[in-house]
Interface confidence: low
């Protein structure tokens, strides 16, 4: 159906299309329409698409009108559920999508004589698809402006742009489906086909021999069976046979006959011949036994001299009979061969719950503790075993005994100490039970038989130096006068503990304070500040490496302070003209002895070893397969005797080769059939058997006959910056950095300004393994001293 809804109307002057007023006359002064407003209603005409709209002609898609819905101006956007402003044009044809719409606003004259008058009209040609969404249109020219919205919606079960695709969900004989948003049928679970009326059979159901009317079913054709109708039904009565097609009976090995029920190998199936008889198959289900000497019968079951084999056990005597033999058993034994012990415990002769043990031609009773005798009929004297522990006497009773306990004991055997602890002990004391008595163990601070007394710990006047004693439970507390401390006020307070003085100053304890005696270079209450000597003591530049200053700490009254410009690895040497040079320790060079001499310059490490520079020394990290201070020794890879089965071992670099004998193969002459196994190639290499040898294809980073040598590739080109040494590490590398550099690839400059080397507020400038001090005004020298 096509729906149109009027949203708003604006006819400010209340005029008609022809310029007249809806209500008749105009005001002579301002020429505005007077009297009542327009009584506005709308007419709609919907027809086929016209590129040039003609007002006349039939409304081929339908027409309609609203009742009077307002005056000159109104807004219906907010009024929901009001159908007065809505026109619905149903259509019973496929919606063509394109259309022409004529909307007219009319004034109702209310009296029948005067015809209704048109206020304004709008036309719109366009295209619209069925949707729940509204499309808003406006008429903004002429005397009145109005706004409306339109939409096309399909009836229930109709879909598509033309509302002409029908889909109604169903679940019956004719189909089992729902409809998607486009009107397509979506089959319910277990159904298929364009109408969803074909059941999906059980998964695996034979398409040839099975079918179904309901989902998940699998109904077999005549002659077939099984969950999936894939097993044929053999001929009825088929015993030891199978079928490939229905009603066959194909015999298994050693079976014959129409129903495969005739045993062709009766001897093998049943082994009927006894006593070593030889069996022969004589026909289906037939056999014959050839008996050894001394035996006869169809199955060699008859012993002709039966007693020869001593068949009677347990000293039974044997008599030959027509059927074989008969045994006469000795007392206590029974059975055809006297091998069954007669049960002398049936019936049980043991009294008072005794357990009967069957013996040969007799029995034995295992009696409960209270009874004795052959059949447990005698009362045992339990007192003989001395069961009473803490008793005056033991009395024997029938099937029992009685212990007369000593005071403080109880229980059948007088072995339970009566608990005399019944809450007598006070103040959380613990009670120890004694025999016919108890003892209270008092917690600290309490005394008395029942721990009822609080001990006064202040009675001995323990507080020293005028301290006041306070008695508490199991303790006392001393309240000390000023200047004393300790649990007994015995300590004159030591303000030097812990030592507050810094930089090695000595601490002196006073009555209520401490004093720090500072070394020459420091000052302050705790000797924590570096003294500016030149502010307090005149100092004299001796040379470009040394200054002298007055001091009480040296015999000659002068202290010499050396410059630390040459760092930790050199000594400053003064030169004329205020210059200096540095005398470097072994292994160091450079203006400030800051450079470690490269001891690796002569390439001392052989056979691909990597040289790591030390201080006045070096160290070789050898390639795989080499060892020694200079990597000069090839490691003997044959030392573990890896070659099996007489193979001869030849040492290679980080590898060995086995010269195999007598048809043995493989890396270690361990195989008869293959040159390769998973151990042949190392480090993930792939082994190829080439008949009389093997070949390893190595992954990246490895080479050698068995992928045992790490390629230098991880160090090429050298990833280590600033002269760092690269060491191969499998498929990776490690950088050993030169002094002054750090980080995984030696790219970070070490902070040579840590800790602060510049004195007197000088600023430190960090270089590559060196620093420079920029001094504050009034100070000079390499470290601004």
């Amino acid at each position: 159906q096509f729906e149109l809804e009027i949203l708003s109307m604006q006819n400010v002057n209340g005029e008609l299309q022809n310029g007249n007023c809806c209500g008749g006359a105009r005001n002579p002064g301002d020429r505005k329409c007077t009297r009542d407003e327009c009584d506005t209603y709308f007419k709609v005409c919907l027809k086929e698409y016209q590129s040039r709209v003609t007002a006349g002609g039939p409304c081929s898609f339908g027409s309609g009108s609203t009742p009077v819905i307002g005056g000159n101006t109104f807004n219906l956007k907010a009024s929901r559920g009001n159908d007065r402003n809505r026109i619905v044009l149903p259509f019973s044809f496929a919606w063509p999508r394109s259309y022409t719409l004529l909307v007219e606003a009319w004034d109702s004259s209310n009296d029948t004589v005067q015809p209704d008058s048109i206020i304004e009209k709008a036309s719109h040609s366009g295209m619209i698809n069925p949707s729940r969404q509204w499309q808003t249109l406006k008429q903004n020219t002429g005397v009145a402006h109005f706004e409306y919205q339109i939409r096309v919606t399909c009836d229930d079960y109709y879909y598509g742009f033309g509302c002409n695709k029908f889909c109604r969900p169903r679940d019956d004989f004719f189909g089992h489906y729902a409809c998607d948003q486009n009107g397509n049928k979506t089959c319910m679970e277990g159904w298929m086909g364009p109408e969803c009326n074909r059941a999906i059979c059980r998964q695996g159901c034979s398409p040839k021999h099975g079918s179904c009317k309901l989902p998940g079913d699998c109904r077999c054709q005549y002659g077939w069976q099984g969950l999936y109708c894939d097993k044929c039904i053999p001929h009825p009565g088929c015993v030891h046979g199978i079928c490939n097609e229905p009603w066959q009976c194909l015999c298994e090995t050693n079976w014959g006959g129409q129903l495969c029920d005739k045993d062709l190998n009766y001897c093998g199936t049943h082994q009927p011949c006894l006593n070593g008889g030889t069996c022969s198959n004589t026909g289906p289900d037939k056999y014959q036994c050839s008996c050894p000497e001394g035996y006869s019968g169809p199955n060699c079951e008859i012993a002709e001299h039966a007693c020869l084999s001593d068949p009677c056990h347990n000293r039974g005597s044997c008599k030959e009979t027509s059927l074989g033999f008969e045994c006469e058993c000795s007392p206590g034994w029974t059975g055809p061969t006297c091998s069954t012990n007669i049960d002398d415990c049936s019936p049980n002769n043991c009294s008072h719950g005794g357990t009967c043990q069957d013996l040969v031609n007799g029995f034995k009773c295992v009696c409960p503790p209270q009874w004795t005798g052959k059949t447990c009929q005698l009362d045992a004297n339990e007192c003989e075993a001395k069961p009473c522990v803490n008793a005056k006497s033991c009395k024997n009773l029938i099937a029992s005994y009685y212990c007369d306990c000593l005071p403080g004991w109880m229980g059948q055997n007088c072995d339970i100490n009566i608990n005399d602890c019944l809450g007598q002990c006070q103040n959380d004391a613990s009670c120890r039970d004694l025999v016919n008595g108890y003892r209270c163990i008092c917690p600290p601070g309490y005394a008395g038989d029942h721990c009822e007394r609080d001990i006064d710990e202040c009675a001995s006047n323990p507080c020293l130096n005028g301290g006041h004693c306070q008695n508490e439970i199991n303790r006392f507390q001393c309240l000390c006068p000023t200047g004393f401390s300790g649990n007994l006020c015995q300590l004159d307070i030591d303000y030097c503990e812990p030592n507050p003085c810094q930089n090695g100053a000595q601490c002196y304890n006073r009555a209520s304070d401490y004093f720090c005696k500072c070394p020459e270079d420091y000052e302050g209450k705790n000797c924590s500040h570096l003294k500016d000597h030149c502010r307090t003591t005149p100092c004299e530049v001796i040379d470009s490496c040394t200054v002298a200053m007055a001091s009480n700490d040296t015999p000659e009254g002068v202290r010499y302070i050396s410059s630390n410009v040459c760092g930790p690895h050199g000594k400053c040497k003064s030169q004329s003209g205020g210059k200096f040079t540095c005398d470097c320790n072994k292994g160091f060079t450079g203006t400030y002895c800051h450079e470690n001499i490269n001891d690796c310059e002569s390439n001392p490490c052989r056979n691909g070893g990597t040289c790591i520079d030390g201080v006045n020394s070096y160290k070789c990290i050898c390639s795989d397969g080499w060892e020694g201070a200079y990597c000069e020794t090839n490691i003997n890879d044959c030392s573990q005797n890896p070659c099996h089965n007489g193979g001869t071992c030849r040492d290679l670099v980080n590898d060995f080769y086995c010269d195999c004998k007598n048809g043995w193969k493989g890396k270690t002459c361990h195989s008869r059939d293959s040159q390769c196994d998973e151990a042949t190639c190392n480090n993930g290499g792939t082994c190829y058997d080439e008949g009389d040898a093997f070949k390893c294809m190595c992954p990246g980073g490895w080479e050698g006959t068995t992928c045992n040598i790490a390629r230098n590739s991880s160090c090429l080109p050298n990833p280590c910056h600033n002269g760092g040494t690269c060491v191969v590490n499998g498929e990776s590398f490690t950088c050993v950095c030169k002094e002054g550099w750090e980080g995984p690839i030696c790219a970070q400059n070490t902070n040579d300004c840590s800790p602060h080397p510049c004195y007197n507020s000088g600023t430190c400038v960090d270089g590559d393994n060196w620093y420079r001090c920029e001094c504050a005004p009034g100070f000079a020298g390499p470290d601004c001293r």
């Epitope: 493989g666 361990h670 195989s671 008869r672 059939d673 293959s674 998973e678 151990a679 190392n682 792939t686």
Partner: antibody, heavy 120, light 108 residues
Framework: QVQLQESGPGLVKPSETLSLTCTVS??????????WSWIRQPPGKGLEWIGY???????NYNPSLKSRVTISVDTFKHQFSVNLTSVTAADTAVYYC????????????WGQGTLVTVSS | SSELTQDPAVSVALGQTVRITCQGD??????ASWYQQKPGQAPVLVIY???IRPSGIPDRFSASRSGNTAALTITGAQAEDEADYYC???????????FGGGTKVTVL
């Protein structure tokens, strides 16, 4: 198809010697490149390799059992055996015999196992 | 050290993928073999070498190795895959055989 079958007593007293035999059918213990192993599994625990023998008589044992174990082969009977001396309750286990190829640690055929309990 | 380490237990939803790992120094040199053991039965070899399945073992079982770690992956686990799984290899010396402690796989 190679088949292996263990046999021997199911109960052994502490301090005595445990002896088991494995019979090989459908194949030969003398075939080159085959190692014949004993493996055990205590109840509710994992597998432990005891040792192997090659048809030439060469053996290799688990270092933790080496002082107590001996494995021997009888190529004519198609059998190989294990002896474990001075047993304790800790030796209670299901004992399996198994075959591996040249890879030595790849057991492709196993016996069904026999439970040996050490108890007095 | 000549040890192989396995997680004691893992669980997997039916049809999902589970990965069992085995760690040890010897695996840098030797491939692991993997065994499936169901209660009351002898172990069964399921995979060995680089990624080789004996006949009769479904292709949902696969193996891989990286560094000192071997892994057994079951893609699309089935109810019948619920079992204990053991890895083993030669030890680092190449002379002895070692087993992992086993991983119990539960299929939910």
């Amino acid at each position: 198809q190679v088949q292996l079958q263990e046999s021997g007593p199911g109960l052994v007293k502490p301090s005595e010697t445990l002896s088991l035999t494995c019979t090989v059918s459908g194949g030969s213990v003398s075939s080159g490149g085959d190692y014949w192993s004993w493996i055990r599994q205590p109840p509710g625990k994992g597998l432990e390799w005891i040792g192997y023998i090659y048809y030439t008589g060469s053996t290799n044992y688990n270092p933790s059992l080496k002082s107590r174990v001996t494995i021997s082969v009888d190529t004519f009977k198609h059998q190989f055996s294990v002896n474990l001396t001075s047993v304790t309750a800790a030796d209670t286990a299901v004992y399996y015999c198994a075959r591996s190829g040249v890879a030595m640690a790849r057991f492709d055929y196993w016996g069904q196992g026999t439970l040996v309990t050490v108890s007095s | 050290s000549s040890e192989l380490t396995q997680d004691p237990a893992v669980s997997v939803a039916l049809g999902q993928t589970v990965r069992i790992t085995c760690q040890g120094d010897s695996l840098r040199t030797y491939y692991a073999s993997w065994y499936q053991q169901k209660p009351g039965q002898a172990p069964v070899l399921v995979i060995y070498g680089k990624n080789i399945r004996p006949s009769g073992i479904p292709d949902r079982f696969s193996a891989s190795r990286s560094g000192n770690t071997a892994a057994l992956t079951i893609t699309g686990a089935q109810a019948e895959d619920e079992a204990d799984y053991y890895c083993n290899s030669r030890d680092s010396s190449g002379d002895h055989v070692i087993f992992g402690g086993g991983t119990k796989v539960t299929v939910l």
